[in-house]
């Protein structure tokens, strides 16, 4: 979470940002609010990114002016028109790019006053585990998939059962670069698992954590998984 | 050269099925967002799915449930299994790259349903 | 959903006039997430303008488009006899979606 202020006179202009993830190949958000103005005439919004001349995005007078933004942008930023007056200054980025990762400033002006406020914005890709039962392997085990990674994850592998105990020597993981040659397939075996246990595949890098639970027993399999970002806010 | 070649059109009976093929080169079709439309007889253009590069599908309200956009990376080629077909899915469809826009279109395949 | 109207539905005009072809969104549209496409009989469309503004790569410069929030606009300086065709304004939505204009067809008067 990252507040800034400005001075405009007398008057101070809090615009709040929070550091975030984008997911490469999908749309992602950067994320800006401010005191809200009424006079939607009065507010320009202007997003830049360090390093790079020209603007990201500008929105000002009710509507975009892109007659300075850079190329590596064009067709591909919104902000949101219609909450700006409550104080969305968030931009929407299409088809997210690793080169999108950077240091970004939201800039505010309205009636009230100026501020802006820095966003520390990572770019890589993450995905939900799958957890299947292997049937093919010798004894039993259990395989956890998950498509797209960048950068490179960690997985380990936990269970309720066994708390604590280290599976590194009973589990072998494999990355696979995909066809676009920047994501990876994550894929991890676990052997000698028992029924009526649940196994955790967690997979981590510094953007993103996911984790695929399993619990097999003799009349059912259940699955969970879920995926947080991390350091963001 | 940046090219995009649709194909596995043809004359389909009512509630049959039918897979479309889009095999792109010069371009990697996993790293783009990738489209299908189409074009009634006569009539104007309508989008029909997207995929996006991380995988993520999206429809349009008058195909959901009954087709699937689809690739295989290996191959460089974008799918459109089209299911339950009906008369008013006849037409002209199209693969198409969206970068900054819809940049590069295919040629076309011609889907025909009627009995 | 966001509308995209197009008008005229047809423009009747002579080579070396000038055409001017409206888009009108049911909501506001983001400039970025405007462009506008060229098809002619038995051919695939052809991307003319993206962002509102930017000419596509290959793209004479007779081509310009404007406009933001709700209104955009299309303008062909000086009609050449391989530009009549039909017209189509697309955006992309926040569904995510994307959608098509009905077209404006530019005839040889």
């Known amino acids: 979470l990252i507040i800034g202020f400005g001075i405009s006179g007398k008057h101070f202009i809090t615009v709040t940002t929070f550091t975030s993830a984008g997911n490469i190949g999908e749309d992602g958000t950067l994320s800006c609010t401010f005191e809200p103005d009424i006079k939607l005439n009065g507010i320009v919004i202007q997003w830049l990114k360090e390093g790079i001349k020209g603007l990201v995005h500008e929105f000002k007078e009710g509507k975009d002016d892109l007659s300075q933004q850079h190329e590596m942008f064009r067709g591909r930023t919104a902000v949101f028109a219609d909450q700006v007056v409550v104080g969305n200054a968030s931009l929407r980025l299409k088809n997210v790019q690793l080169t999108d990762a950077g240091t970004y400033t939201c800039y505010i002006h309205t009636s009230k006053g100026k501020g802006n406020a820095n966003l520390e914005y990572k770019t890589g890709a993450f995905s939900m585990p799958e957890i299947n039962v292997d049937y093919n392997a010798s004894s039993e085990s259990l395989r956890c998939e998950a498509p797209r990674w960048f950068p490179q994850p960690t997985v380990a592998w936990a269970s309720q059962v066994d708390q604590g105990a280290n599976f590194s020597e009973v589990s072998n993981t494999s990355f696979e670069l995909n066809s676009e040659n920047v994501t990876m397939k994550v894929v991890s075996v676990l052997y000698n698992v028992t029924i009526n246990n649940t196994y955790s595949c967690m997979i981590e890098n510094d953007i993103a954590k996911a984790t695929g639970d399993i619990k097999v027993t003799d009349s059912e399999v259940k699955r969970r998984s879920q995926l947080e970002l991390l350091n963001s806010g | 050269e940046v090219q995009l070649v649709e194909s596995g059109g043809g004359l389909i009976q009512p509630g049959g099925s039918l897979r479309l093929s889009c095999a792109a080169s010069?371009?990697?079709?996993?790293?783009?967002?990738m489209n299908w439309v189409r074009q009634a007889p006569g009539k104007g253009l309508e989008w029909v799915s997207v995929?996006?590069?991380?995988?993520?599908?999206y429809y349009a309200d008058s195909v959901k449930g009954r087709v699937t956009i689809s690739r295989d990376n290996s191959k460089n080629t974008l799918y459109l299994q089209m299911n339950s077909l009906r008369a008013e899915d006849t037409a002209v469809y199209y693969c198409?790259?969206?970068?900054?826009?819809?940049?590069?279109w295919g040629q076309g395949t011609t889907v025909t349903v009627s009995s | 959903e966001i509308v995209l109207t197009q008008s005229p539905g047809t423009l009747s005009l002579s080579p070396g006039e000038r055409a001017t072809l409206s888009c009108r969104a049911s909501?506001?549209?983001?400039?970025?997430?405007l462009a506008w496409y060229q098809q002619k009989p038995g051919q695939a469309p052809r991307l003319l303008i993206y962002?509102?503004?930017s000419r596509a790569t290959g793209i004479p410069d007779r081509f310009s488009g404007s406009g933001s929030g709700t209104d955009f606009t299309l303008t062909i300086s000086r009609l050449e006899p391989e530009d009549f065709a039909v017209y189509y304004c697309?955006?992309?939505?926040?569904?995510?979606?994307?959608?098509f204009g009905q077209g404006t067809k530019l005839e040889i008067k």
């Open positions: 010069g371009f990697t079709v996993s790293s783009n967002y």
């Open positions: 995929i996006y590069g991380s995988g993520r599908t």
């Open positions: 198409a790259r969206d970068t900054y826009a819809m940049d590069v």
């Open positions: 962002g509102a503004s």
């Open positions: 697309q955006q992309y939505g926040s569904s995510p979606m994307y959608t």
């Open positions: 909501q506001s549209v983001s400039s970025s997430y």
